[in-house]
Interface confidence: medium
């Protein structure tokens, strides 16, 4: 590397590189100072004078050491489906990310260009794959023995309760209704248990039925409802 005593501008040795925070000006054929982040080159160097740097104006920035004649413009204000996670300053661009309940359908180098609402699985369908910052929710029909009675982007299919005496059999979109007093939760075959995402919905609870006068003979009805007629997963 050139001797550290050289002051900019200076001519590098043929084929050599300039020092850190210096660049080779091809017009002057000299090593000249770069401008620091938050600045830009107001006057380029010559053989006898170094780069003159100036601060970026409002709503413009430079994030890197540079020798650009003008600072870069900050991106436009975040849209209503976005939140500003990094403000526009002289040293960094504004970054917009999607607000909760939305995902990034079209990303850019930093942040998101286009947000879209997370798909909601309708009753009879549960979340097979939760949404992430950059991917939509994937829904699946509730398997026999499971149900979802909500329109939600977070709820999975849950097992029907097992009744001593069944009043109404469950289906894909409704839990079983019991006539006995002490229903027990089934771990029904085919139920897929995903880690429950943080959700604001209230837990589904079955109202406590009246005490039954029926004999206490236990029996189970077949729990498998016929698959939903509609094949789509809904919005």
């Amino acid at each position: 590397l050139p001797a550290q005593v050289a002051f900019t501008p200076y001519a590098p040795e043929p084929g050599s590189t300039c020092r850190l925070r210096e660049y080779y000006d091809q017009t002057a054929q000299m090593c000249c100072s770069k401008c620091s982040p938050g600045q830009h080159a107001k006057v380029f160097c010559t053989k006898t004078s170094d780069t003159v740097c100036d601060s970026c104006e409002d709503s413009t920035y430079t994030q890197l050491w540079n020798w650009v004649p003008e600072c870069l413009s900050c991106g436009s204000r975040c849209s209503s489906d976005q939140v500003e996670t990094q403000a526009c300053t002289r040293e960094q661009n504004r970054i917009c990310t999607c607000r909760p309940g939305w995902y990034c359908a079209l990303s850019k180098q930093e942040g998101c260009r286009l947000c879209a609402p997370l798909r909601k699985c309708r009753p009879g369908f549960g979340v097979a794959r939760p949404g992430t910052e950059t991917s939509d929710v994937v829904c699946k029909p509730c398997a026999p023995g499971t149900f979802s009675n909500t329109t939600s982007s977070t709820d999975i299919c849950r097992p029907h309760q097992i009744c001593n005496v069944v009043a109404i059999p469950g289906n894909a979109s409704m839990d079983a209704v019991c006539t006995s007093t002490s229903p027990t939760r089934s771990m029904a075959p085919g139920a897929v248990h995903l880690p429950q995402p943080v959700s604001t919905r209230s837990q589904h609870t079955q109202p406590t039925p009246e005490p039954s006068t029926a004999p206490s003979t236990s029996f189970l009805l077949p729990m498998g409802p016929s698959p939903p007629a509609e094949g789509s997963t809904g919005d």
Epitope: G15, T17, Y24, T62, V68
Partner: nanobody, 117 residues
Framework: QVQLVESGGGLVQPGGSLRLSCAAS????????MGWYRQAPGNQRELVAA???????NYADSVKGRFTISRDNAKNTLWLQMNSLKPEDTAVYYC???????????RGQGALVTVSS
Amino acid sequence: QVQLVESGGGLVQPGGSLRLSCAASGSISDFYAMGWYRQAPGNQRELVAAISSSGKPNYADSVKGRFTISRDNAKNTLWLQMNSLKPEDTAVYYCYADDYSAGFELRGQGALVTVSS
């Protein structure tokens, strides 16, 4: 804008060797200068080695004879071969490139090199 990604860092014993790679997401043939600098906690960043587009290397006195910088424009990759490592070589190593079409110094996220017994 081209992205630079370093790899090859890690823990090595004194006297050992490591090879750092810097892969660019686009062509590096127009980058007049590329190089490596390092920064240890609480220290200024220090230019370790640089190489011009014509392939001429330059080294800091502290690494001369131990480190070798090379670049392959066809593979869009920069390398730093580090031999006879010393504890004082411990730092985060960054690759950089002077992008003349943009007027910016690009740099990677860094690779941690720890030299310790």
